[in-house]
Amino acid sequence: CKAMHVAQPAVVLASSRGIASFVCEYASPGKATEVRVTVLRQADSQVTEVCAATYMMGNELTFLDDSICTGTSSGNQVNLTIQGLRAMDTGLYICKVELMYPPPYYLGIGNGTQIYVIDPEPCPDSDF
């Protein structure tokens, strides 16, 4: 297993609709054809997997049908979008990149993006 540098923004504020997008960029040392991207969430020292996708270079990322993540890839960059977020989902989202094929296997883990989510203000009651 060889180490690889992964860069991601430090802080992102999700949209009012609970959608957060950020780029995860990895310094690929070779010509990988198969890449696996995993998003981990760290909150109070607990780490949970949010979503994961394996893709072939040049193809779209394919997450599971019920995943809250979508993404696109371009060269050594992966543009990740997480949707359906609420205030309670605020936390550190870490991008993990694995170059699966061809060998050697490379692993890179970013420092994390602190995603803040604000629940929309409830609409005031109206007579209509």
Epitope: S15, S16, D44, T90
Partner: antibody, heavy 116, light 108 residues
Framework: QVQLVQSGAEVKKPGASVKVSCKAS????????ITWVRQAPGQGLEWMGW????????HYAQKFQGRVTMTTDTSTTTAYMELRSLRSDDTAVYYC?????????WGQGALVTVSS | EIVLTQSPGTLSLSPGERATLSCRAS???????LAWYQQKPGQAPRLLIY???SRATGIPDRFSGSGSGTDFTLTISRLEPEDFAVYYC?????????FGPGTKVDIK
């Protein structure tokens, strides 16, 4: 090294608007947020809101909602805070700070005096 | 919104003494997201502690932070003349971010 340099002191009349700038250098501007904090004479720190330089999304303190606008210009790595309908109790030093996510670097402050 | 309360309001001590400042949150957020700032007259605040217990770059080791849940403490082990200032706690675990009202450490 990381630096935030703010615009100079301003004197405004009640009802006017003020726009304070905050020029950032020494780091990747879009990777962080910029927050604005004010301090009235002899008072504590009051959080006004913040902007994510990555995507331009903002969150304002309820007290300032509708009266404040925070923006960034990524081409010049500058953040702006505009406060409208100024009142005498808006007289304060206005600070910008980097959200990293703690407020790890601060500008020197800009004194805004509201007086008729 | 998380409300922060600081005590005492003023702490009168002599150089060389130990200072213990308290910060209490109205609700338990993420304990990793509490910061302490120092502010001297006419100056911008300066980050001392982040993540409740991690010292910021260039901060002397006489400053230490501890606590979790709703109760946090800033300790200055031996007060130096330059430590007399106002100290604010702040939570950045959820937006809106909030500050405590501050504790003034002055010379006895």
């Amino acid at each position: 090294q990381v630096q935030l340099v703010q615009s100079g002191a301003e004197v405004k009349k009640p009802g006017a608007s003020v726009k304070v700038s905050c020029k950032a250098s020494g780091y990747t501007f879009t990777s962080y947020g910029i927050t604005w904090v004010r301090q009235a004479p002899g008072q504590g720190l009051e959080w006004m809101g913040w902007i994510s330089a990555y995507n331009g999304n903002t969150h304002y303190a309820q007290k300032f909602q509708g009266r404040v606008t925070m923006t960034t210009d990524t081409s010049t790595t500058t953040a702006y805070m505009e406060l409208r309908s100024l009142r005498s109790d808006d007289t304060a030093v206005y600070y910008c700070a980097r959200v990293g996510p703690s407020f790890d670097y601060w500008g020197q402050g800009a004194l805004v005096t509201v007086s008729s | 919104e998380i409300v922060l309360t600081q005590s005492p309001g003023t702490l009168s001590l002599s150089p060389g003494e130990r200072a213990t400042l308290s910060c209490r949150a109205s609700q338990s957020g993420s304990s990793s997201y509490l910061a302490w700032y120092q502010q001297k007259p006419g100056q911008a605040p300066r980050l001392l502690i982040y993540g409740a217990s991690s010292r910021a770059t260039g901060i002397p080791d006489r400053f230490s932070g501890s606590g979790s849940g709703t109760d946090f403490t800033l300790t200055i082990s031996r007060l130096e003349p330059e430590d007399f200032a106002v100290y604010y706690c702040q939570q950045y675990g959820s937006s809106p971010f909030t500050f405590g009202p501050g504790t003034k450490v002055d010379i006895k």
